[in-house]
């Protein structure tokens, strides 16, 4: 988890002098509770936005937006703590909006935004906005949270971001798999424009089951430049096991930008349809 560029982060707006600060996620008001605390944020909204770094890279960011409730506690609001927790790693990053002037009610509802938390493809985050100071131990909570899922690199808008392109999102192998005679599969796919090797991982399963009955790995050496964007055809021999008929073919590239952690593409061949067994024809016809 990180912030997009450390260019000047702004939270000031007409009628409010405000500064954005790094935070330890442990605000002082936890340790030294205050008697009067503000109410919670209203209408927390999170969207996926895209932002360029100063180097020109494009990253997905969480755009966080919330409004203030129109009650008197606005007079005791000193700022806000924004927290993003990545659920699979338990990594947390916080920033603090510090209000340098007192808020006053004005003709429209106060609204705040922040769009600098860089998020990763296919990850889930808990996004929390905590008004400061935080409540006393038994006080009403004054935060709002949402669990936010970021689309993976298959998403059209995500595909062109720097992290997705680095993992090979622009490569479309257009895999085709056909069953040949004599227990063989022909796998065909389009090579990318990089001289790097590939691996084909074949996993076979029985008709309705999910434990594999056959596994095979096939190495494809790095293509020459004249072979870039050409089709590569590979014939794989299957184990002759009755009922081991559903085949998943996965192609793993080893691009220089992602090495052994590149996006994999797969295709599945289903078991052939079993024809309905016809009713047996009796040897004689009953006469009734």
């Amino acid at each position: 988890l990180r912030l997009l560029d450390h260019r000047a982060l702004v939270c000031s707006q007409p009628g409010l002098n405000c500064t954005v600060k790094n935070s330890t996620c442990l605000d002082d008001s936890w340790i030294h509770p205050r008697n009067l605390t503000p109410s919670s944020p209203k209408d927390l909204q999170i969207q996926l936005h895209f932002a360029h770094t100063q180097q020109g890279d494009l990253f997905p960011v969480a755009h966080i937006e919330w409004t203030l409730q129109t009650d008197a506690s606005i007079l005791y609001l000193e700022g806000a703590e924004l927290s993003v927790l990545q659920l699979n790693t338990n990594e947390r990053l916080c920033v603090r909006f510090e209000f340098l002037s007192k808020l006053r009610h004005h003709h429209r509802r106060w609204r705040f935004t922040f769009s600098h938390f860089v998020v990763d493809p296919d990850q889930e985050y808990e996004v929390t906005v905590h008004h400061l100071p935080k409540p006393i131990p038994d006080g009403d909570p004054n935060h709002q949270s949402k669990n936010f899922l970021v689309p993976d690199c298959e998403h059209a808008r995500m595909k062109v971001t720097t992290p997705c392109m680095s993992s090979g999102s622009l490569w479309d192998p257009n895999i085709t798999v056909e069953t040949l005679e004599a227990h063989q599969l022909r796998v065909s796919f389009t090579l990318w424009n990089e001289s790097t090797h590939y691996q084909i991982l074949l996993t076979s399963f029985p008709h309705m089951e999910n434990h594999s009955c056959f596994e095979h790995m096939h190495h494809i050496p790095a293509p020459r430049p004249e072979e870039f964007h050409q089709r590569s055809n590979v014939t794989l021999t299957l184990r002759n096991l009755k009922g081991c008929c559903r085949h998943q073919v996965q192609i793993q590239p080893f691009f220089s930008s992602c090495l052994n952690d590149c996006l994999r593409h797969s295709a599945t061949v289903s078991c052939p349809e079993m024809p309905d067994t016809p009713e047996p024809i009796p040897d004689y016809m009953p006469l009734w």
């Epitope: 909204q45 999170i46 969207q47 996926l48 936005h49 969480a62 755009h63 937006e65 949402k146 669990n147 936010f148 899922l149 970021v150 689309p151 993976d152 298959e154 998403h155 059209a156 808008r157």
Partner: nanobody, 126 residues
Amino acid sequence: QVQLVESGGGLVQPGRSLRLSCAASGFTFDDYAMHWVRQAPGKGLEWVSGISWNGGSMDYADSVKGRFTISRDNAKNSLYLQMNSLRAEDTAVYYCAKDRGLGYCRGGSCSSLDYWGQGTLVTVSS
């Protein structure tokens, strides 16, 4: 322009099933999370279910969990709600709605729902 058109509502007996459909047009359907929201007679709006852009994540209101199933077919720009074991309290106008922003939030919409269909009435009565 964005259009969401619901269909499949009607009168059904308690315990029976119904499948609602929503045909979407005018935007890139597979970029956005989609939701079903309902409004019972004389009541406010109630979020029913949501589904992520690719159908990989789905969430339901407690009142329908285990009975309703949301799904989508991005190739057909369509959203569905399979409603089983219907109860009288499921009687409502059901709306299909699009999330304003990209991304998906558990248990509701991430941001406001910016486009809604005209709704389809589901009446559960014996």
